[in-house]
Amino acid sequence: VPRWRQQWSGPGTTKRFPETVLARCVKYTEIHPEMRHVDCQSVWDAFKGAFISKHPCNITEEDYQPLMKLGTQTVPCNKILLWSRIKDLAHQFTQVQRDMFTLEDTLLGYLADDLTWCGEFNTSKINYQSCPDWRKDCSNNPVSVFWKTVSRRFAEAACDVVHVMLNGSRSKIFDKNSTFGSVEVHNLQPEKVQTLEAWVIHGGREDSRDLCQDPTIKELESIISKRNIQFSCKNIYRPDKFLQCVKNPEDSSCTSEI
């Protein structure tokens, strides 16, 4: 008789999740010399220990502490790029501008990017059928708590000028409920971070509006200023040209505004 299993509203654990995490870890530690001493089996043990046998609506940041410790990574703190609702362009940018880092360019972000996972209370099984949805089921689920925890640590580690890429095509360019708006903004350390510079990415080719004047950007400026961090904002009118100019800064067309 099949055992009754909790049905959640979200998709289940990504297939071959353990193998994927382990393989990503091995690949990452081979490529990044500063992480080559990391034991990927211990990393997987710590990852697994954070959610296996635990109720998937009752996960805490403390559950992830061992994984966070093993994944501690010293990235240049003045080369951090945060993003909100524009992941692909942010990643394309750091693939070209190799000295800058998004969260997904770090070991922990790389391990979990685009994956889903959850377990079940009191069993050592991984749930491949369904996992809690943040809105419909619960916010303290394994995936949400993981990203909240790594995002907080990533923001805490930042210094000097921190950049954030924002999606100018969305109704809320800055969304207080996004990971950036609810976690990262509030965990930048004013004693280390001098400026937050927002890059607002335009969607339409003919969109010449100054989206830095958008009310949600003004709201972000207000939050940041109250935290004693300076704020600046730039419009990126042509993201395609922006990336091209990052690749080839000597190009004559790259002196004009992008």
Epitope: E34, S53, E61, E156
Partner: antibody, heavy 123, light 110 residues
Framework: EVQLLESGGGLVQPGGSLRLSCAAS????????IIWIRQAPGKGLEWVAA?????????YYADWAKGRFTVSKDNSKNTVYLQMNSLRAEDTAVYYC???????????????WGQGTLVTVSS | DIQLTQSPSTLSASVGDRVTITCRSS????????LAWYQQKPGKAPKLLMY???NLASGVPSRFSGSGSGTEFTLTISSVQPDDFATYYC??????????FGGGTKVEIK
């Protein structure tokens, strides 16, 4: 009161083995990283290994300690162990166990230390 | 391998003197400021003085202060007291949760 008490040190011949113990009391043992750190006579401090076991042991080692040293834990006895094999003269040191501060803002620092146990490797 | 270099290795001071110890790391510490300072007296275990470069550990007198970021850090004792003659170690926290200690600075009575 937080207490860590090391034992098991002594004289051992090169190539020999030794198991050190670190008995803990006064705190919730499962919720902290316990770190082994050593100090050669008249020299500086050097970290050896770390263990944490809220649910299953999670452990890791200094590069030089991998393969020869093994850290383990017995939660029922509130004790951490350091098994040292293939010992060499350069392993002669006082071995300390220390408790790391808890909380993500404080990890990476050692707030409570044992008194140390001396290991001498000599023929 | 990460190297933490402390200078000077020995320092002679009189009671009331201002003392500064420097610690240089071959790699940036985690978060730019994840560095601690410890005090050790002969035959005793080290005692945590300072964490995250500039935060005073519980019960440590305010004459101790720390500063620095990235790879360069300093520990200052504004007015050395008889109880402060000891050896001081810096300790950094790095990628993969690894630790490294400096070689130590012995503060002795002039």
């Amino acid at each position: 009161e937080v207490q860590l008490l090391e034992s098991g040190g002594g004289l051992v011949q090169p190539g020999g083995s030794l198991r050190l113990s670190c008995a803990a009391s006064g705190f919730s043992f499962n919720n902290y990283w316990i770190i082994w750190i050593r100090q050669a006579p008249g020299k500086g401090l050097e970290w050896v290994a770390a263990i944490y076991s809220p649910s299953g042991d999670i452990k890791y080692y200094a590069d030089w300690a991998k393969g020869r040293f093994t850290v383990s834990k017995d939660n029922s006895k509130n004790t951490v162990y350091l098994q040292m094999n293939s010992l060499r003269a350069e392993d002669t040191a006082v071995y300390y166990c220390a408790r790391e501060l808890s909380g993500s803002s404080y990890e990476g620092y050692f707030e409570s230390w044992g008194q140390g146990t001396l290991v001498t490797v000599s023929s | 391998d990460i190297q933490l270099t402390q200078s000077p290795s020995t320092l002679s001071a009189s009671v009331g003197d201002r003392v500064t110890i420097t610690c240089r790391s071959s790699q940036s510490v985690y978060g730019h400021n994840w560095l601690a300072w410890y005090q050790q007296k002969p035959g005793k275990a080290p005692k945590l003085l300072m964490y995250r470069a500039s935060n005073l550990a519980s019960g440590v007198p305010s004459r101790f202060s720390g500063s620095g970021s990235g790879t360069e850090f300093t520990l200052t004792i504004s007015s050395v007291q008889p109880d402060d003659f000891a050896t001081y170690y810096c300790q950094g926290y790095y990628s993969g949760g690894s630790y490294a200690f400096g070689g130590g600075t012995k503060v002795e009575i002039k």
